[in-house]
C-alpha cells in the first residue's frame, strides 16, 4: 500500500507510517516501527503532560513559590499542571499567576465596589452623593449618610463622600 | 546483513550475576530498539524489555523489573542484558532481537550450586 | 498483559497437506486506528526464532509464498498451503501493539 501522507486524531507521521501519539501523562520513549506499537512512560512525580503527544520529556509542575505569595490551589497531576493563587490578602499579577501584590485598598470617599479574589484585585468606587467612606480599606463599601430625620434630629452639619451628615437637635421656639 | 552475536554459554551460581552482551552488525545500531526474550527449557518466549538506543530509555515487561537491566554501548554497537540474584528459575536460553525481525542465536545460561 | 491462546497445541500434518495454527488474543489488537501488530514466527529445534509474518498478513523477507496469515481483532489465523518438511518446528504468535509484548504458547507441527 503507499505510504501515508497524513495521519488520523490521535497518530503522527515518521518515516512514512502512522504512530499513535501517547496518552496524556506519558511521554514518548519509543516511536512505532513496522512490528511493534509507539512506546510510551509515564510521567515522573512532580511532571505532567496534558495533551495527546510525542514529547520525550514531561513538563515540570509549576512551582508555588512562598516568596512570592503563592500557594498551591490544585495540585498537578501527571495530565494537569499545578494552580497556583496567592495567600490571603493578596492577588495574581498576571493569569499564569506567577507572583502576587497586596489587594488595593479604596482611600476616602472610595468604597468597594468589588472585593479581591486571589486572581483579581480590589475594584474601588467613588462614593456617590448620599455616601461616604472615611477610612481606606480594601473591604469597607460606602456608608450611607445617618439620617437624621429618623431620629427626630437636624442636619447640623452637611455630609461629604468623606464624612457622615452632623446631627443636632432641632432648634424650639421659646414661648 | 544484519547480524546479533551473543556470548557462549554461561553456568553462574545462584545469587550471582551475568552479563549477556549482543553485538550487532549490519545496520546503524541507533535506528532500531533492542529487544531481550526468555525461553525457558521447552516453554514459550517472554518479552523481558526492550531499550532505545538513541536514548538509552529501557522499557521492562513487570515481570523482570529488578531481575534484569538494559543497556547499551553505543561506540561497539552492543547492547546488554544484566541478570541478577540468579535462581534456577532464571535458567534459560537468552535472546536479543532488532525488533522481532532478525535474533541472535540465544544464550543459555545455567544456574546450578 | 494480553494472553495470547494458540490452537491447537501440537498439530501432526503429512508432507503436501495444509496446515492451519489458530491465535487469539485477550483483548483487541488494534489501538488507534492503527496497524494491527500480530506477528508469527517458526522456531525451528536448536534455533532462533525466525520472523515468518508481521502486521497479520505480510509476509517478511525470503518467506516462501505458502505462509500466509489472516484475521482481525482479536482472533487471527497462519496457514501453511503446502506443508514441506522445512516447515516443521514450533510456530508461535506475538502481539505487539500493547506493551509488555507477549507471545503464544506456541504450536509443534509434527510430522503424522
Known amino acids: 500500500p503507499e505510504p501515508p501522507t497524513a495521519c488520523r486524531e490521535k497518530q503522527y507521521l515518521i518515516n512514512s507510517q502512522c504512530c499513535s501519539l501517547c496518552q496524556p501523562g506519558q511521554k514518548l520513549v519509543s516511536d512505532c516501527t513496522e512490528f511493534t506499537e509507539t512506546e510510551c512512560l509515564p510521567c515522573g512525580e512532580s511532571e505532567f503532560l496534558d495533551t495527546w503527544n510525542r514529547e520525550t520529556h514531561c513538563h515540570q509542575h509549576k512551582y508555588c513559590d512562598p516568596n512570592l505569595g503563592l500557594r498551591v490551589q490544585q495540585k498537578g497531576t501527571s495530565e494537569t499542571d499545578t494552580i497556583c493563587t496567592c495567600e490571603e490578602g493578596w492577588h495574581c499579577t498576571s493569569e499564569a499567576c506567577e507572583s502576587c501584590v497586596l489587594h488595593r485598598s479604596c482611600s476616602p470617599g472610595f468604597g468597594v465596589k468589588q472585593i479581591a479574589t486571589g486572581v483579581s484585585d480590589t475594584i474601588c468606587e467613588p462614593c456617590p452623593v448620599g455616601f461616604f467612606s472615611n477610612v481606606s480599606s480594601a473591604f469597607e463599601k460606602c456608608h450611607p449618610w445617618t439620617s437624621c430625620e429618623t431620629k427626630d434630629l437636624v442636619v447640623q452639619q452637611a455630609g461629604t463622600n468623606k464624612t457622615d451628615v452632623v446631627c443636632g437637635p432641632q432648634d424650639r421656639l421659646r414661648a | 546483513e544484519v547480524q546479533l552475536q551473543q556470548s557462549g554459554p554461561e553456568l553462574v551460581k545462584p545469587g550471582a550475576s551475568v552479563k549477556i552482551p549482543c553485538k550487532a552488525s549490519?545496520?546503524?545500531?541507533?535506528?532500531?530498539?533492542m529487544d531481550w526474550v526468555k525461553q525457558s527449557h521447552g516453554k514459550s518466549l517472554e518479552w523481558i524489555g526492550d531499550i532505545n538506543p538513541n536514548n538509552d530509555i529501557s522499557i521492562y515487561n513487570q515481570k523482570f523489573r529488578g531481575k534484569a537491566t538494559l543497556t547499551v554501548d553505543k561506540s561497539s554497537s552492543t547492547a546488554y542484558m544484566e541478570l541478577r540474584s540468579l535462581t534456577s528459575e532464571d535458567t534459560a536460553v537468552y535472546y536479543c532481537a532488532r525488533r522481532f525481525a532478525y535474533w541472535g542465536q540465544g544464550t543459555l545460561v545455567t544456574v546450578s550450586a | 498483559d494480553v494472553v495470547m491462546t494458540q490452537i491447537p497445541l501440537s498439530l501432526p500434518v503429512s508432507i503436501g497437506d495444509q496446515a492451519s495454527i489458530s491465535c487469539r488474543s485477550s483483548q483487541s489488537l488494534v489501538y488507534s486506528y492503527g496497524n494491527t501488530y500480530l506477528h508469527w514466527f517458526l522456531q525451528k529445534p536448536g534455533q532462533s526464532p525466525k520472523l515468518l509474518i508481521y502486521?497479520?498478513?505480510n509476509r517478511f523477507s525470503g518467506v516462501p509464498d505458502r505462509f500466509s496469515g489472516s484475521g482481525s481483532g482479536t482472533d487471527f489465523t497462519l496457514r501453511i498451503s503446502r506443508v514441506e518438511a522445512e516447515d516443521l518446528g514450533v510456530y508461535f504468535c506475538s502481539q505487539g501493539t500493547h506493551v509488555p509484548w507477549t507471545f503464544g504458547g506456541g504450536t509443534k507441527l509434527e510430522i503424522k
Open positions: 502486521n497479520v498478513s
Open positions: 549490519g545496520y546503524t545500531f541507533t535506528d532500531y530498539n
